[in-house]
């Protein structure tokens, strides 16, 4: 009785989820009498996987035929593998006992590991925009992968980041893992067609990384430039006003025009031109009736951008002075808007 | 009908040692990890460890390594725990209780002893 | 270790009264949680085993749930001997351990 061994050839496999596991055991004879069971992990919390006298184990089948009077092949298959089968696998003899058969004798044990691939990286950024110059974070998450080890990079562009913090967890044994990481992003008036890419590695993907984007024009905003100029126009009583609102992202503006600190006309960007870096143009004109006019009239550019505090520029028009002497002829970047007379 | 007879209170001076039992009938004794839980006077439970009377095969919760060591008598169906070098600390009740010989829901810490009262005392 | 933190630790309720005492475990162990009552004399007693199932020969006043890792022990309709200590044992993994009780006090 002594005599018997029970092996389990295999210190370890490992399987991808999704595929079957086959785990090895065989008896080196066939004495004493009495069935053979699988349990995953040891101690008092080890779980039965297979019972050959009795109960009902749907994902696994022996590999041979037990019922055949010789055999000495106690492998099985267990189907449909997922992470969470992950563990350390005991093929053990009993012996025929009355009434219980007693655990007689176990195999050294396989370790079963799973590869599961990572979950296709989710990109976050802030909740609210932020200008040029400041420091964004960005997170990148991932889950569900097996074994730990893993490799995140960021790029911006394509150019690498280094600014950047991972953590995989749980710490300890699991499962499956998942991974976070948070980096940090300086943002340029340039990066309204920047991309954040975060590219993750892993023993499954066979070198094809998978990759999780964030678009920085969901992130920024480019406040304006105002300048506001005159020019004339045919008719010697009348000047022309215009207000160009340069460099600006994203497109959601409105511009007040303000007499002398008075609301003269309230409009909403429409009909805009894109630059090569992805921030707008926009322009407003104002045609003012000088005539109508005793004193010299302060107007004011008034641009609420983005939801921000409002930003203006003001130009002082001397009505005592020739029109034609005024200002300069900057009509080349007029992309239109309303006119409008002061009477 | 399943049952767990516990030793009798104990009275120990500091330094010593006590070992109690736990003797089992009503069911097979080998199926079974029998295990030792704690509970100091006024506090909760603690678990000390479990030994499984096939193969003496024990498990032990770290706070309780080298302070009690889990043995068996097959034969008579009888666990036993050591305590030793006793303190204040050890003074508690002991109770023993079961579970299946794999982890089968329904057979975890149903059966307990009575419990047995060790007093450290100089 | 997985912690099991219970509350409350001690409740004062009317017979008749519904009451709920709670474990919340610090990690994942599934449905494997026991509770345990233990009587002024040390007699301890498993009430509900994996999570909800009713031990035989328990009063069906008493009913186990989970809610993520919260983990609840009802009674519904206190009698007089229920005005006992409750405990937790989680059982997924070792070492094995216990919430810290409930004593339940009659009003």
């Known amino acids: 009785e002594e005599g018997l061994q029970v092996i389990q050839p295999d210190k370890s496999v490992s399987v991808a989820a999704g595929e079957s596991a086959i785990l090895h055991c065989t008896a080196t004879s066939l004495i004493p009498v009495g069935p053979i069971q699988w349990f995953r992990g040891a101690g008092p919390g080890r779980e039965l996987i297979y019972n050959q006298k009795e109960g009902h184990f749907p994902r696994v089948t022996t590999v041979s035929d037990l019922t055949k009077r010789n055999n000495m092949d106690f492998s099985i298959r267990i189907g449909n593998i997922t992470p969470a089968d992950a563990g350390t696998y005991y093929c053990v003899k009993f012996r025929k006992g009355s009434p219980d058969d007693v655990e007689f004798k176990s195999g050294a044990g396989t370790e079963l590991s799973v590869r599961a691939k990572p979950s296709a990286p989710v990109v976050s950024g802030p909740a609210a925009r932020a200008t040029p110059q400041h420091t964004v974070s960005f997170t990148c998450e991932s889950h569900g992968f097996s074994p730990r080890d893993i490799t995140l990079k960021w790029f911006k562009n394509g150019n690498e980041l280094s600014d950047f913090q991972t953590n995989v967890d749980p710490v300890g044994e699991s499962v499956s893992y998942s991974i976070h990481s948070t980096a940090k992003v300086v943002l340029t008036r340039e990066d309204v067609h920047s991309q954040v890419i975060c590219e993750v590695a892993h023993v499954t993907l066979q070198g094809d990384p998978l990759r999780g984007t964030a678009n920085l024009s969901e992130t920024i905003r480019v406040p304006p430039t105002l300048e506001v100029t005159q020019q004339p126009v045919r008719a010697e009583n009348q000047v022309n006003v215009t207000c160009q609102v340069r460099k600006f992202y994203p497109q959601r503006l409105q511009l007040t025009w303000l007499e002398n600190g008075n609301v003269s006309r309230t409009e909403t960007a429409s009909t805009v031109t894109e630059n090569k870096d992805g921030t707008y143009n926009w322009m407003s004109w104002l045609l003012v009736n000088v005539s109508a006019h005793r004193d010299d009239v302060k107007l004011t550019c008034q641009v609420e951008h983005d939801g921000q505090p409002a930003v203006s520029k003001s130009h002082d028009l001397k009505v005592s002075a020739h029109p034609k002497e005024q200002g300069s002829n900057t009509a080349a970047e007029n992309t239109g808007s309303n006119e409008r007379n002061i009477y | 009908e399943v049952q767990f007879q516990q030793s009798g209170t104990v009275l120990a001076r500091p330094g010593t040692s006590v070992k109690m039992s736990c003797k089992a009938s009503?069911?097979?004794?080998?199926?079974?990890?029998m295990h030792w839980v704690k509970q100091g006077p006024g506090q909760g439970l603690q678990w000390i460890g479990a030994?499984?009377?096939?193969?003496?095969?024990?498990t032990y919760n770290q706070k309780f390594k080298g302070k009690a060591e889990l043995t068996v008598v097959t034969s008579t169906s009888t666990a036993y725990m050591e305590v030793s070098s006793l303190t204040n600390e050890d003074s508690a009740v002991y109770y023993c209780?079961?579970?299946?010989?794999?982890?089968?829901?329904?057979?975890?810490?149903?059966?307990w002893g009575q419990g047995t009262l060790v007093t450290v005392s100089a | 270790d997985i912690q099991m933190t219970q509350s409350p630790s001690s409740l004062s309720a009317s017979l008749g009264e519904r009451v709920s005492l709670t474990c919340r475990a610090s990690?994942?162990?599934?449905?494997?949680l026991n509770w345990l009552q233990q009587e002024p004399d040390g007699t301890i007693k498993r009430l509900i085993y994996?999570?909800?199932s009713l031990d035989s020969g328990v009063p069906k006043r008493f009913s186990g749930s989970r809610s993520g890792s919260d983990y609840s022990l009802t009674i519904s309709g206190l009698e007089s001997e229920d005005f006992v200590d409750y405990y937790c044992?989680?059982?997924?993994?070792?070492?094995?351990?216990f919430g810290g009780g409930t004593k339940l006090e009659i009003n």
């Open positions: 994996a999570t909800s």
């Open positions: 009503g069911s097979t004794f080998t199926s079974y990890w």
């Open positions: 044992l989680q059982y997924a993994s070792s070492p094995f351990t």
């Open positions: 209780t079961r579970s299946f010989y794999y982890s089968l829901d329904a057979a975890w810490f149903v059966y």
């Open positions: 990690q994942d162990i599934g449905s494997r």
């Open positions: 030994i499984y009377p096939v193969n003496n095969d024990t």
